[in-house]
Interface confidence: low
């Protein structure tokens, strides 16, 4: 019995459209395939960025896959051609592995890149990064940010910065459409006429990152003698109701601070009838439900009742 | 704009196949899927399946799988939809509609191409 | 497969009114926090329209009148105030999984 062999796939690359971190791996079929015409020969690839103790593993028919990547960092990936046992007659047969590496090789010290990158999507709606120039960069020095996600035709710069001193050091981005729920890749360069400036590469998912405005209408009702219904709204905007987690502050007569995280937009509190003052305010935020990770909204406005009947009387802001 | 421009109407024979094309512009067409759907002749929508435009990989609606083939041409930005073994109930107009992702809906559909299947 | 159920299938409403429409899918069309739900309006010889994709998220351009919501198995689409130009066939349609599918269709009609 001769020993069945294969090739590993050629022309194996990992190409960069220029999309800030979303990276095309692609390769071309193994040489003498000709033995295996009736046979649909599959690719196990794999991919990691260097220094990441765990690969990536795909296996696939096609002759390209895509993912993100950390361009802070560089990228190695192996490939090998794998023909199923029904192809041999016995057991699967692998080829040698081809590999391939990409980086970009980076310019000016570490130093140099922006500080303290911090990123916002208000209210599902508005995207706000903001950030400090790189330690000991002079006042020539200016950052430029691109971004890029899955709908753009190419990464754009940012059009309405943020400045202090002649510096950009944020941006206001305008509406995203579609962006949620996929990858969002952003660089962040600089030019300077004294030194290079090290590039610096962020990618999160807006729904992640979302902080949403406070609730609003916070009112009063007396259910029972001893009972009494904290309510409030969810906040105009694209936000639904099922996507929020709230906490209450609740101050009675000053001395007790009750605190409560709930995801109904109501609340009862067991009181007495001796309570003279009862305050409470609420913030928002978005649930596991909807996304893996959030920031608190501020505080709503401060809504109290002060020595009155809670049963004749129920406040609206 | 996005637009999808779809081949014109055919009238084909029982047992024949039909290749209806669609061709997109206005947009990155290597980013999104195109789907295939039909609607019979005062019926509802019935999906037939869809194609990454990118590396070319198909997903089919069972009831579709022996007879529908999808094709891509990334360099005309064209997706082709070939329908074989065609009978009466084949009678429909077929849409090509543009989707990012499985929760971004179809967002852009071409004008529709009526098939006829008639003897 | 996953199988849509609209109703009502058929409407008469008058302009200004609050239409309500429903839709029922035979398993949870939930994942990952979202509901892969979509609604679209279709007029007679004319392809469908993109309203609602994810349950409650507008398709760009649609007028604020058109809403989304539910989430699971049980979905409603509101026209807040029907105008002239909203008289059209409505689907909904599930793309959690391969077949996606269509509900029969909603007729929204003059009283």
């Known amino acids: 019995d001769t020993e069945i062999k294969v090739n590993p796939p050629q022309d194996f690359e990992i190409v960069d459209p220029g999309y800030l971190g979303y990276l095309y791996l692609q390769w071309q079929p193994p040489l003498s395939l000709d033995h295996f015409k009736e046979c649909t020969v599959e690719y196990e690839l794999k991919y990691r960025n260097i220094g990441s103790e765990t690969w990536k593993t795909i296996i696939t028919k096609n002759l390209h896959y895509k993912d993100g990547f950390d361009l802070n960092k560089g990228i190695e990936a192996k490939i090998h051609t794998l023909l199923p046992w029904q192809c041999t007659n016995g057991s699967e047969v692998q080829s040698s592995w081809a590999e391939t590496t990409y980086w970009i090789s980076p310019q000016g010290i570490p130093e140099t890149k922006v500080q303290d990158m911090d990123c916002v999507y208000y209210n599902w709606q508005y995207l706000l990064c903001s950030w400090k120039p790189g330690i000991g960069v002079l006042l020539d020095t200016n950052y430029n940010l691109f971004y890029w996600y899955e709908g753009l035709d190419h990464a754009l710069q940012c059009v309405d910065y943020i400045k202090a001193d002649g510096q950009n050091i944020g941006c206001r981005f305008p509406y995203l459409e579609a962006s949620d729920y996929k990858d969002f890749y952003i660089c962040v360069n600089g030019s300077s006429e004294n030194k290079p400036i090290r590039s610096s590469y962020f990618t999160f998912q807006l729904q992640n990152i979302v902080k949403p405005l406070p609730p609003v209408y916070l009112t009063f009702t007396r259910e029972s003698s001893c009972e009494i219904k904290l309510k409030w709204s969810i906040p105009l905007g694209p936000i639904p109701a099922r996507c929020f987690d709230y906490e209450i502050e609740i101050r009675e007569d000053d001395t007790t601070l009750v605190t409560a995280t709930v995801e109904n937009e109501t609340y009862t509190l067991k009181t007495t009838n001796e309570t003279r003052q009862l305050c409470f305010v609420v913030r928002s935020k978005v649930n596991i439900y909807c996304s893996d990770d959030g920031i608190w909204s501020e505080w709503s406005d401060k809504q109290c009742w002060e020595g009155e009947d809670l049963s004749k009387k129920t406040l609206l802001r | 704009q996005v637009q999808l421009v779809q081949s014109g109407a055919e009238v084909v024979k029982p047992g024949a196949s039909v290749k209806l094309s669609c061709k997109a512009s206005?947009?990155?067409?290597?980013?999104?899927?195109m789907n295939w759907v039909k609607q019979a002749p005062g019926q509802g929508l019935e999906w037939i399946g869809r194609?990454?435009?990118?590396?070319?990989?198909?997903h089919y609606n069972q009831k579709f799988k022996d007879r529908a083939t999808l094709t891509v041409d990334k360099s005309t930005s064209t997706v082709y939809m070939e329908l074989s073994s065609l009978r009466s109930e084949d009678t429909a107009v077929y849409y090509c509609?543009?989707?990012?992702?499985?929760?971004?809906?179809?967002?852009?559909w071409g004008q529709g191409t009526l098939v006829t299947v008639s003897s | 497969d996953i199988q849509m159920t609209q109703s009502p299938s058929s409407l008469s409403a008058s302009v200004g009114d609050r239409v309500t429409i429903t839709c029922r899918a035979s398993?949870?069309?939930?994942?990952?926090?979202?509901?892969?739900m979509n609604w679209f309006q279709q007029k007679p010889g004319k392809a469908p329209k993109l309203l609602i994709y994810?349950?409650?998220r507008q398709g760009s351009g649609d007028p604020s009148r058109f809403s989304g919501s539910g989430s699971g198995t049980d979905f409603t689409l509101t026209i807040s105030s029907l105008q002239p130009e909203d008289f059209a066939t409505y689907f909904c349609?599930?793309?959690?999984?391969?077949?996606?599918?269509f509900g029969q269709g909603t007729k929204v009609e003059i009283k």
């Open positions: 509609a543009r989707g990012y992702g499985d929760a971004y809906g179809m967002d852009h």
């Open positions: 206005g947009y990155t067409f290597t980013n999104y899927w």
């Open positions: 194609i990454d435009a990118y590396a070319g990989e198909t």
């Open positions: 398993e949870s069309v939930d994942n990952y926090g979202i509901s892969f």
């Open positions: 994810a349950a409650s």
């Open positions: 349609q599930q793309s959690k999984e391969v077949p996606w599918t």
